[in-house]
């Protein structure tokens, strides 16, 4: 089990990268002047208390920015949000903080991120560029849920 967050860069199958704009994560085509965020991920240390065979439960943060991805209900719908939070504080909690946890599954080079708090809901980007990251239940339709991870340093 990792005890230090692993920095990664994430892009989708259309080579769009994640960018922070007004405290919102959006997916944009990779260009010269685009500075993608570096994502920190760390495995939950209470993996034995979570569902087996769903993927590796991880916390996702924005490297160096004290912001973490979380899922919360807005009305009836789970939404993806950025919250001010130290990823190591989440890691060290005595129980899994499910609202901040995602099951990370890998199939070949593709990764998916499923909300632990809202099973069946995945981090996604709209097929159109320049859109915020969202949560979706609809895989492979109007939204892209497959991402590529590149480990940094």
């Amino acid at each position: 089990k990792s005890e230090m967050p692993q920095p990664v860069s994430i892009q989708d199958i259309n080579h769009r990268v994640w960018v922070l704009q007004d405290q919102i994560l959006i997916a944009v085509p990779r260009k010269d002047r685009v500075s993608p965020v570096t994502i920190s991920l760390i495995s939950c240390r209470h993996v034995e208390t979570l569902e087996k065979d769903r993927g590796n439960p991880i916390y996702l943060g924005l490297n160096g920015l004290n912001l973490c991805l979380m899922c919360a209900k807005a009305g009836d719908q789970p939404t993806l949000q950025l919250k001010e939070k130290d990823i190591m504080d989440l890691y060290n909690q005595p129980e899994p903080v499910k609202s901040f946890l995602f099951y990370h599954s890998q199939s070949g080079r593709n990764s998916t991120f499923e909300s632990v708090a809202f099973p069946g809901w995945f981090i996604a980007v709209s097929s159109e560029g320049g859109c915020p990251l969202i949560l979706t239940q609809e895989l492979g339709k109007a939204n892209t849920t497959d991402f590529g991870l590149t480990m940094l340093f």
Epitope: E48, T49, D89, Q93, E95, K98
Partner: antibody, heavy 121, light 109 residues
């Protein structure tokens, strides 16, 4: 409002089993952890264990492994504690509590009223 | 298994300040013990006061504060009210299990 309502007092013979219920209202037990704690007469609190009702995973204090079984029925929003092979030392008030994450830490924010289990021959 | 020890009883004057402590048999209490404090008033339900050493639970009056003090977890009550007369229990995390203290009976007199 948020409430945890436990089943009534029980008197059991040594060697018997007992099942205590904890019915939640005002929130969905799938969204939190339910802890069980006991208080023997004149004693402090003792942690028994906890259940994650959403997926049924449990943690127990080593002392209660094999003695206590925690379950939950999300359709009725109820958590259960079953104690087996009862002895007089198991006479205590048993409490359920919600252990919830509120932005920065986990807290015991709501408790049941307690269920007195008396073990006597 | 670890033993968690609290003062059996303490007395404070109305408006006064009192500190309840929680000692671990395994050594100094640290932030990774995620100290919790709960209150039991006669004839009432338990209520959670503090989580994660120093985070007040929602709705808990500001006169209650949690900290680490001399290798122990501490609950400080500043400006005690008559209604604060109660039993107070601390609980410490040790890896994957939780251990409660024996409780402190606080009298406001």
């Amino acid at each position: 409002q948020v409430q945890l309502v436990q089943s009534g007092a029980e008197v059991k013979k040594p060697g018997a089993s007992v099942k205590v219920s904890c019915k939640a209202s005002g929130f969905n037990i799938k969204d939190t952890y339910i802890y069980w704690v006991r208080q023997a007469p004149g004693q402090g609190l003792e942690w028994i264990g906890r259940i994650d009702p959403a997926i049924g995973t449990t943690r127990y204090d080593p002392k209660f492994q094999g003695k206590a079984t925690l379950t939950a029925d999300t359709s009725t929003n109820t958590a259960y504690l079953e104690l087996s092979s009862l002895r007089s030392e198991d006479t205590a008030v048993y409490y359920c509590a919600r252990y919830d994450y509120s932005g920065s830490s986990f807290y015991f924010d709501y408790w049941g009223q307690g269920t007195l289990v008396t073990v006597s021959s | 298994q670890a033993v968690v020890t609290q003062e059996p009883s303490l007395t404070v004057s109305p408006g006064g300040t009192v500190t309840l402590t929680c000692r671990s048999s395994t050594g100094a209490v640290t932030t990774s013990n995620y100290a919790n404090w709960v209150q039991e008033k006669p004839g009432q339900l338990f209520t959670g006061l503090i989580g994660g050493t120093n985070d007040r639970a929602p709705g808990v009056p500001a006169r209650f504060s949690g900290s680490l003090l001399g290798g122990k977890a501490a609950l400080t009550l500043s400006g005690a009210q008559p209604e604060d007369e109660a039993d107070y229990f601390c609980a410490l995390w040790y890896s994957n299990h939780l251990v409660f203290g024996g409780g402190t009976k606080l009298t406001v007199l």
